[in-house]
């Protein structure tokens, strides 16, 4: 581990003196002196600072721009930034969630492995043998082929990854 520095945790060094940092939610107004404590002031409305700091300006809360498909997931405080998320059917383009894109749909032949969230896109997977998807969807999984046998029917047309099997009646034995 790093050896300890001249000033303790939650202090900073200025002009050969250790001053107290400002607590989260407050900004620095003036450094301490030999005779006075550090002077701090609370951040204003729509501003925040999330660490012990010596910042002279608070940061502005993030704006969740509806024109970019964003909405507020969690309102910011003096100590935390606003958290944005995307409108229903959309997801963030980055971890910072600065804009949104429409969830992708899984094409026919593919099913939804994982439904999209506000922060992650749809994950598709190819329908394996015995399963199919005949629609483009952001929700539908691959469906299993119909089991003709359980209906006392026979397969008239084999299924594919995009189509279900076609069942039909069994051929009657001729006399």
């Amino acid at each position: 581990p790093e050896p300890p520095t001249a000033c303790r945790e939650k202090q900073y060094l200025i002009n050969s003196q250790c001053c107290s940092l400002c607590q989260p939610g407050q900004k620095l107004v003036s450094d301490c002196t030999e005779f006075t404590e550090t002077e701090c002031l609370p951040c204003g409305e729509s501003e925040f600072l999330d660490t012990w700091n010596r910042e002279t300006h608070c940061h502005q809360h993030k704006y969740c721009d509806p024109n970019l498909g964003l909405r507020v997931q969690q309102k910011g405080t003096s100590e935390t930034d606003t958290i944005c998320t995307c409108e229903e059917g959309w997801h963030c383009t980055s971890e910072a969630c600065e804009s949104c894109v429409l969830h992708r749909s899984c094409s026919p032949g593919f099913g939804v492995k994982q439904i999209a969230t506000g922060v992650s896109d749809t994950i598709c997977e190819p329908c394996p043998v015995g399963f199919f998807s005949n629609v483009s969807s952001a929700f539908e999984k691959c469906h299993p082929w119909t089991s003709c046998e359980t209906k006392d029917l026979v397969v008239q047309q084999a299924g594919t990854n995009k189509t279900d099997v076609v069942c039909g009646p069994q051929d009657r034995l001729r006399a």
């Epitope: 300890p4 303790r8 060094l13 002009n15 050969s16 250790c18």
Partner: antibody, heavy 116, light 107 residues
């Protein structure tokens, strides 16, 4: 009144180590930081590092990280600077200085001469 | 590192003169500029701290001013005992750094 009394001049051999002492009086020793500064003729003043005598915590100038070690003995109100692997480049006057405000009170300086 | 520059390395003035010594930082140092006096015998004293604060026991003929990157020390009514070398030093960020010094001599 505030006083920083440094150890006397020293003549040391290249490759050896030595320690400069700085005895503080006239104030609460652990309440103020101690700086060390190097002065070579015609080379100006160079800050070596700063020590918190209360906690033993330090900050060093990168140029002196492998050269100087700052410590303190609270029981005797004395700060120390150990200099290692001495070369002719280390020949200088070294000052200990009490902080706040700025470099407020200076010791009289200790002349270190490195010579074979 | 922040570079501190004292462009005038030596200065001659007469007793009773008003003398100004300047110092420039390579970047904004807020107000954290200190001035020191080193006498010919090597003793060093703090004169001015944080641009304009007069250290205890320092005569009021010493005055500091400046902001941002440009600072100055003014000695009004120069006296014989003011013959010394004057150094500026920034206390804003580590490593602390000094100017090269201005040697003040009597004409």
């Amino acid at each position: 009144q505030v006083r920083l009394q440094q150890s006397g001049a020293e003549l040391v051999r290249p490759g050896t180590s030595m320690r400069v002492s700085c005895k503080a009086s006239g104030y609460a020793f652990t309440n103020y930081l101690i700086n060390w500064v190097k002065q070579r003729p015609g080379q100006g003043l160079e800050w070596i590092g700063i020590l918190n005598p209360g906690s033993g915590g330090t900050n060093y100038n990168e140029n002196f990280k492998d050269k100087a070690t700052l410590t303190a003995d609270k029981s005797s109100n004395t700060a120390y600077m150990q200099l290692s692997s001495l070369t002719s480049e280390d020949s200088a006057v070294y000052f200990c200085i009490r902080g706040s405000p700025g470099f407020a009170y200076w010791g009289q300086g200790t002349l270190v001469t490195v010579s074979a | 590192d922040i570079q501190m520059t004292q462009t005038t390395s030596s200065l001659s003035a007469s007793l009773g003169d008003r003398v100004t010594i300047s110092c420039r930082a390579s970047q904004d140092i807020n107000i954290y500029l200190n001035w020191y006096q080193q006498k010919p015998d090597g003793t060093v004293k703090l004169l001015i701290y944080s641009t304009s604060g007069l250290h205890s026991g320092v005569p009021s003929r010493f005055n500091g001013s400046g902001s941002g990157t440009d600072y100055s020390l003014t000695i009004s009514n120069l006296e014989q005992e003011d013959i010394a070398t004057y150094f500026c030093q920034q206390g804003y960020t580590l490593p602390y750094t000094f100017g090269g010094g201005t040697k003040l001599e009597i004409k």
